[in-house]
């Protein structure tokens, strides 16, 4: 999906009322010194791109996330403010569903969480301009 | 817990340069962005720069164009704001603030240097 | 750059009173402001980010809201601590310019 044409600050302004606080709530008992952030972005479509990736595809050690409220929240977000994102995401649905897991929050997932909230992070922050 | 640890105060002669360290504590010291605000006596606050500690890239106010250099050392987890051609009208509280979780807003600052500038 | 305007640059009030401060940008900047308070000597302390979202740990007698270019910070009822200086700062584009600032003052 392309996510050049999704409304930013809409998803932002989600992100920061809602999303935001339900990673929190999932990272909490974390020190904020434990991860660095290795995972980047250079631009919002690409920002959402990683986000998107990260969030909702398994990998090696953490194959839960899809199922946490900031996920559910995101895309959520991403279909209401994204222009033809729904469409796009219905035979990943159905895989995922096939798949469901039992929710176990591994060191991995954490890791995970914590890159996300980098990703977020860089996505939100203002236009930096060089003067 | 998060902590923003600035120099002490300054006193300077107009035309010199003078260099304020902002010691950060607490969180991951490269995955966040360091902003520099100045505030004269009795006025308001003025947005001097950024700087992104993990590459070194920078964004500075027209303003201090070409006067001022933000730096960072990952080593120490310390930041660095040096203002040259020092004039009476920078004499002011100089603080360091840290990026929020969100990258929305500042939420830690530092507790700022007293910098004088007189002949 | 975008300019932020507040207003009053100042006002008095008495404790329990409601009051309202206002900021407006010179350009559309969306939901992305910030509001702090600052007490004489110190360093200032978030309250409000992305124009309505309470930092934790700030008391719920404070609220933002607006977008676009008009905002607001509202405090329900003044409390003897919440007599400071507040500014805005928008969180658009560099430079991320502040307010003018309004010295809350104890009538």
């Known amino acids: 999906y392309d996510f050049t044409n999704c409304d930013f600050e809409k998803i932002k302004a989600a992100y920061l009322s809602t999303i935001s606080k339900d990673l929190i709530t999932y990272m909490s008992g974390t020190k904020s010194t434990e991860f660095n952030n290795t995972v980047s972005c250079s631009n919002r479509p690409h920002c959402l791109t990683e986000i998107q990736s990260l969030t909702f595809n398994p990998t090696a050690g953490c194959a839960s996330l899809a199922k946490e409220m900031f996920a559910m929240k995101t895309k959520a977000a991403l279909a209401i403010w994204c222009p033809g994102y729904s469409e796009t995401q219905i035979n990943a649905t159905q895989a995922m569903k096939k798949r469901r897991k039992r929710k176990v929050t591994t060191n991995k997932c954490l890791e995970q969480v914590s890159q996300l909230q980098g990703l977020w992070r860089r996505f939100n922050r203002p236009l930096l301009k060089q003067q | 817990q998060v902590q923003l640890v600035q120099s002490g105060a300054e006193v300077k002669k107009p035309g010199a340069s003078v260099k304020v360290s902002c010691k950060a504590s607490g969180y991951a010291f490269t995955n966040y962005l360091i902003e520099w605000v100045r505030q004269a006596p009795g006025q308001g606050l003025e947005w001097m720069g950024i700087?992104?500690?993990?590459?070194?890239?920078?964004y500075y106010a027209q303003k201090f164009q070409g006067r001022v250099t933000l730096t960072a050392d990952k080593s120490t987890s310390t930041a660095y704001m040096e203002l040259s051609s020092l004039r009476s009208e920078d004499s002011a509280v100089y603080y360091c603030?840290?990026?929020?979780?969100?990258?929305?807003?500042?939420?830690?600052w530092g507790q700022g240097t007293t910098l004088t500038v007189s002949s | 750059d975008i300019q932020m305007t507040q207003s009053p640059s100042s006002l008095s009030a008495s404790v329990g009173d409601r009051v309202t401060i206002t900021c407006r940008a010179s350009e559309n900047i969306y939901s992305n402001l910030v509001w702090y308070q600052q007490k004489p000597g110190k360093a200032p302390q978030l309250l409000v980010y992305?124009?309505?979202n309470l930092q934790s740990g700030v008391p719920s007698r404070f609220s933002g809201s607006g977008s676009g270019t008009q905002f607001s910070l509202t405090i329900s009822s003044l409390q003897p601590e919440d007599f400071a200086t507040y500014y805005c700062q928008h969180f658009y584009e560099t430079p991320l310019t502040f307010g003018t600032g309004t010295k809350l003052e104890i009538k």
């Open positions: 700087i992104n500690p993990e590459s070194g890239d920078t």
């Open positions: 603030a840290k990026e929020s979780l969100t990258g929305s807003s500042y939420d830690y």
């Open positions: 992305g124009a309505r």
